[in-house]
């Protein structure tokens, strides 16, 4: 990409996996790349195979072990290198020093579930995945409620500024169908960003009890 | 916001030696590796060599692999480009540039740009 432009994004799930973007205008779809892991003071490398995602846009995950192992701490330094092939040799397109603990994204929030419903409330919690014990409490959560006739983008976001994995939804309307996503972010990190937001938790509300004033 | 200025630029003899500097300023930049690019008059800027500033780690066009040798000195903040075996067709104006976190060949992948050094090799 001389005249276009170029862009190869990384993020560290905080325990074992690095999941790469690498975009360029111009490239052929069914060209052949990988991006390499370079630690500066692991014995181990990782290789894996981008693969197409959009027209000009191909992603992989280095897969770094168990998904629950701490592979990388917040000292090490990852050298990430992409990699294309040029005819019978390959041809590095990319090198970023890869600083793991500034580039984090967390795995979705999983196993949330209706801990309580009422009328006009309902309480849910949620548990964290692969998130690195480094944290302690040093996580934050955003989280949505999908209301009937509203889109997910129109759903305002309400914030939890500490380790909370659990909400009190309120001012709810009886007897209604909702849906409710979270999503976590560590504190640390220049890069750091949102995790995807988590499978959505339908739940419905009690009725209001009948003859009585909601 | 990085600052970049160049210098070491002049007028050399074909097959002579020259060493280019670059003094970065700014806030992290370690995260804003640098790349050196060149235009000849009449042409386009091109591509010569680039480097991360943790790993050292290097990229080269093929138009200079074996003459020319980028470095850094993290202490000065300082890239290097030692050219040597110069040729009249390495005659351009030599801009150092900075890139958040990735170094590209593509010059549009920099965001930086300082105001270039004149390099003239007479043969």
């Known amino acids: 990409a001389v005249n276009g432009t170029s862009q190869f994004t990384c993020f560290y799930n905080s325990r074992a996996n690095i999941s790469c973007v690498w975009s360029q205008d111009g490239a052929l779809q069914d060209t052949s790349c990988q991006v390499h892991a370079w630690p500066d003071r692991r014995r181990w490398n990782q290789t894996c195979e981008l693969l197409p995602v959009s027209q000009a846009s191909w992603a992989c995950n280095l897969i770094l072990g168990a998904p629950d192992s701490q592979k990388l701490t917040t000292v090490d330094i990852v050298t990430l290198r992409v990699l294309c092939r040029e005819g019978v040799r390959w041809r590095v397109m990319a090198i970023q020093d890869f600083k793991p603990f500034e580039n984090l994204r967390l795995m979705a929030p999983i196993s949330l579930q209706v801990v309580h419903v009422e009328t006009h409330r309902c309480n849910i919690s949620w548990e964290i995945s692969q998130a690195s014990h480094y944290f302690e409490r040093h996580l934050e959560f955003e989280a949505r409620t999908l209301s009937p006739g509203h889109t997910w983008e129109e759903a305002p976001l309400l914030t939890l500024k500490q380790k909370q994995e659990w909400i009190c939804l309120e001012t709810l309307t009886p007897d209604t169908q909702y849906e409710f996503q979270v999503r976590v972010k560590p504190l640390q990190g220049e890069f750091t960003t949102w995790s995807p937001w988590s499978q959505p938790l339908a739940f419905r509300t009690k009725p209001a009890a009948l003859g009585k004033d909601t | 916001e990085v600052q970049l200025v160049e210098s070491g630029g002049g007028l050399v003899q074909a097959g002579g030696s020259l060493r280019l500097s670059c003094a970065a300023s700014?806030?992290?930049?370690?995260?804003?590796?640098v790349g050196w690019f060149r235009q000849a008059p009449g042409k386009e800027r091109e591509f010569v060599a680039a480097?991360?500033?943790?790993?050292?780690?290097?990229l080269y066009a093929d138009s200079v692999k074996g003459r020319f040798t980028i470095s850094r000195d993290n202490a000065k903040n300082t890239v290097y480009l030692q050219m040597s075996s110069l040729k009249p067709e390495d005659t351009a104006l030599y801009y150092c540039?900075?890139?958040?976190?990735?170094?590209?060949?593509?010059?549009?992948?920099?965001?930086?740009w300082g105001q270039g050094t004149q390099v003239t090799v007479s043969s």
């Open positions: 540039a900075a890139a958040l976190k990735t170094i590209t060949r593509g010059q549009n992948d920099y965001s930086y």
């Open positions: 480097i991360t500033w943790i790993s050292g780690s290097t």
């Open positions: 700014g806030r992290a930049i370690e995260n804003y590796p």
